[in-house]
Interface confidence: medium
C-alpha cells in the first residue's frame, strides 16, 4: 500500500460518550493536524474514509454505515452515532486520501454507562464560580450541532441526583443554570439533560460538569508571608542544623501562577556553593486559596552561613512580597569557673 502520513493514536483526544445517546465526533485531522479544513479537502478531490479497531482487537475493520435507522452515519467530517452502543468502544481512524496524498489519525472512543444519578467513569469538566460574587452562569456544554435551531429541546438540570427546582440560589434558565450568589454548598456535580426529537424519535443528551466555588477576585490580596516574621529569631551554633520555613498564603486567582522562593545573600540557592536543601508542601482551602511552605535547610551551619541574609520571596498575579528571616549565631554561655579563676589570680 502507498505511504500514508500516520499521526498515530491521538490519546490527547480521549473521547468519552454515554451509552444510548447520540454522539457526533469530528475527524481530528482538520482540527489539530492539517492546515486546511474539510471543505477545502473535499473541493480538492480528497475522500474521507473511516474505519475502526474494536476494543481488545488488532484488526482494523470498516465501519458499517448500513445499520437499521442509520445508527452510524457520516456527514462531512463528522461521524454520527444515533445512538451509541456499549460495544462501539474502540479506536477510530479517519483517513483523508486521493491517489497522491494520504493522511490519517486514530483516536480512542469510550462508550460509558451512567447510573440513575448520572454517576459514571466520565472525566468531568470543572467550572469555577467565584464565591459570593453576584449572578454567575454555567451553560450546558457540547450540545451544539445535534439539532437545528428550529428545534426547541427541553432541558432539565440536576444537582447530583436531585432535579433543580425551588433551590434557594440556583435557577435553571434553559441551557443556562444561574447561581444568584455562589456558596461553598453549591460545590458539586451538575447535570443537564437535553431532550430533542429527530425523525419521529426522541434523543437525550446528558452533560455533567463539576462546579467548584473558589475565592472571589474581590477578596484577593497579594501574597501574605506568615513566616519568617519579626517575632521568630533563628539562633544557632555552628554545626547545628538550620531550618527556616517560609509559609505564604495566596488568595485564589484564576490562572495565576503562585511562586515561592528563597534567596541567600541575594542569590538563588542553586547559584551558591553552600549545601542547602529546599522542601515544599502545599495545602488548599476549600475555595482554593493556597498555603505554600518552603523549608530552607542547612544540615551543618557555619558561622559564615549565620551571617548571610536569608530572604523568602513570594509572587502571584496580585503582586510580589519578600521577608528576611532573623538569623544569628548563638552566643555561648560564659564559662564561670575559668573567669573566676582568672579574677582571683595573684597580682
Amino acid at each position: 500500500s502507498e505511504r500514508c502520513d500516520d499521526w498515530g493514536l491521538d490519546t490527547m483526544r480521549q473521547i468519552q460518550v454515554f451509552e444510548d445517546e447520540p454522539a457526533r465526533i469530528k475527524c481530528p485531522l482538520f482540527e489539530h493536524f492539517l492546515k486546511f479544513n474539510y471543505s477545502t479537502a473535499h473541493s480538492a478531490g480528497l475522500t474521507l474514509i473511516w474505519y475502526w479497531t474494536r476494543q481488545d482487537r488488532d484488526l482494523e475493520e470498516p465501519i458499517n454505515f448500513r445499520l437499521p435507522e442509520n445508527r452510524i452515519s457520516k456527514e462531512k467530517d463528522v461521524l454520527w452515532f444515533r445512538p451509541t452502543l456499549l460495544n462501539d468502544t474502540g479506536n477510530y481512524t479517519c483517513m483523508l486520501r486521493n491517489t497522491t496524498y494520504c493522511s490519517k489519525v486514530a483516536f480512542p472512543l469510550e462508550v460509558v454507562q451512567k447510573d440513575s444519578c448520572f454517576n459514571s467513569p466520565m472525566k468531568l469538566p470543572v467550572h469555577k464560580l467565584y464565591i459570593e460574587y453576584g449572578i454567575q452562569r454555567i451553560t450546558c456544554p457540547n450540545v451544539d450541532g445535534y439539532f437545528p435551531s428550529s428545534v426547541k429541546p427541553t432541558i432539565t438540570w440536576y444537582m447530583g441526583c436531585y432535579k433543580i427546582q425551588n433551590f434557594n440560589n440556583v435557577i435553571p434558565e434553559g441551557m443556562n443554570l444561574s447561581f444568584l450568589i455562589a456558596l461553598i454548598s453549591n460545590n458539586g456535580n451538575y447535570t443537564c439533560v437535553v431532550t430533542y426529537p429527530e425523525n419521529g424519535r426522541t434523543f437525550h443528551l446528558t452533560r455533567t460538569l463539576t462546579v467548584k466555588v473558589v475565592g472571589s477576585p474581590k477578596n484577593a490580596v497579594p501574597p501574605v508571608i506568615h513566616s519568617p516574621n519579626d517575632h521568630v529569631v533563628y539562633e544557632k551554633e555552628p554545626g547545628e542544623e538550620l531550618l527556616i520555613p517560609c509559609t505564604v498564603y495566596f488568595s485564589f486567582l484564576m490562572d495565576s501562577r503562585n511562586e515561592v522562593w528563597w534567596t541567600i545573600d541575594g542569590k538563588k540557592p542553586d547559584d551558591i556553593t553552600i549545601d542547602v536543601t529546599i522542601n515544599e508542601s502545599i495545602s488548599h482551602s476549600r475555595t482554593e486559596d493556597e498555603t505554600r511552605t518552603q523549608i530552607l535547610s542547612i544540615k551543618k551551619v557555619t558561622s559564615e552561613d549565620l551571617k548571610r541574609s536569608y530572604v523568602c520571596h513570594a509572587r502571584s498575579a496580585k503582586g510580589e512580597v519578600a521577608k528576611a528571616a532573623k538569623v544569628k549565631q548563638k552566643v555561648p554561655a560564659p564559662r564561670y569557673t575559668v573567669e573566676l579563676a582568672c579574677g582571683f589570680g595573684a597580682t
Partner: antibody, heavy 120, light 113 residues
Framework: SVEESGGRLVTPGTPLTLTCTVS????????MGWVRQAPGKGLEYIGI??????TYYASWAKGRFTISKTSSTTVDLKITSLTTEDTATYFC?????????????????WGQGTLVTVSS | DIVMTQTPASVSEPVGGTVTIKCQAS??????LAWYQQKPGQPPKLLIY???ALASGVSSRFIGSGYGTEFTLTISGVQSEDAATYYC???????????????FGGGTEVVVK
C-alpha cells in the same frame, strides 16, 4: 454550622449512636472528624470520614468506633460496648486544610459537643 | 502513631506579657501542625494552621513557628481574654492511606494575672 446529638446517660456495655448534622455546606464536599474530651481532660482524636466516604481512625478507636455518612448533611458515630472510660463530650468538627491527596489537616468548624455519660 | 508532647502544662502571665507554649512531635511532621484555643464550656477554636499560618479572624498577637518536630505558639501582649487552654494538633501519614492520622497535644492552661 455543626450540631451533635444523641449523647445521654448509659450503662456499661450499651451501644450508642451519635449524630452530627451540618448546615451551610455539604458532606459530599467536606471531610468531618470526631474528637472527644473526657471531663477535665484534653482533646482526643477518634477519626475522620472523607468527602468520598473513606474512614480513618485513631489506632485505639479501630473496631469499637464506626463513622458513617448517612446523608449529605449527617454523619453518625457508632460506639459499641461503652465503658466508663468513654464518658466524655463528643465533638464533631469540619476538617479542612486539604493537601494534594485530599487529606484534611486541621478542624476549623466545631459543634458545641454532646455529653455521653457511662455509669452503672 | 505520633505522640505530641506539649509544655508547660500550665503557665501564668500578667496582662501585656508574652506566653510561649511548646509542642514536640515524636517524629517529623514538617509543617502539618495546628493550634487551638479552648475556653471552658466551649468547643476549640482554630488559631494557627500549617505551623505558622494565621486562621481567619484571629489576632496577629498569636504567632506560630517551627518545623519538623519542634513547634512554638507565642502569644505576645497577652490580654485577659486569652485565658484558656491551648492545644497543638498534628497530621501525619499524608498521602499514605491507612497510616494517615491526627494527634493532639495534652494542652496548656494559660492563666492571665
Amino acid at each position: 454550622s455543626v450540631e451533635e446529638s444523641g449523647g445521654r446517660l448509659v450503662t456499661p456495655g450499651t451501644p450508642l449512636t451519635l449524630t452530627c448534622t451540618v448546615s451551610g455546606f455539604s458532606l459530599n464536599v467536606y471531610n468531618m472528624g470526631w474528637v472527644r474530651q473526657a471531663p477535665g481532660k484534653g482533646l482526643e482524636y477518634i477519626g475522620i470520614i472523607s468527602s468520598s466516604g473513606t474512614t480513618y481512625y485513631a489506632s485505639w478507636a479501630k473496631g469499637r468506633f464506626t463513622i458513617s455518612k448517612t446523608s449529605s448533611t449527617t454523619v453518625d458515630l457508632k460506639i459499641t460496648s461503652l465503658t466508663t472510660e468513654d464518658t466524655a463530650t463528643y465533638f464533631c468538627a469540619r476538617a479542612d486544610g486539604y493537601t494534594e491527596g485530599d487529606y484534611a489537616t486541621y478542624f476549623n468548624l466545631w459543634g458545641q459537643g454532646t455529653l455521653v455519660t457511662v455509669s452503672s | 502513631d505520633i505522640v505530641m508532647t506539649q509544655t508547660p502544662a500550665s503557665v501564668s502571665e500578667p496582662v501585656g506579657g508574652t506566653v510561649t507554649i511548646k509542642c514536640q512531635a515524636s517524629q517529623s511532621i514538617t509543617t502539618w501542625l495546628a493550634w487551638y484555643q479552648q475556653k471552658p464550656g466551649q468547643p476549640p477554636k482554630l488559631l494557627i494552621y500549617q505551623a505558622s499560618a494565621l486562621a481567619s479572624g484571629v489576632s496577629s498577637r498569636f504567632i506560630g513557628s517551627g518545623y519538623g518536630t519542634e513547634f512554638t505558639l507565642t502569644i505576645s501582649g497577652v490580654q485577659s481574654e486569652d485565658a484558656a487552654t491551648y492545644y497543638c494538633q498534628c497530621t501525619y501519614g499524608i498521602g499514605s492511606g491507612s497510616s494517615y492520622g491526627v494527634a493532639f497535644g495534652g494542652g496548656t492552661e494559660v492563666v492571665v494575672k
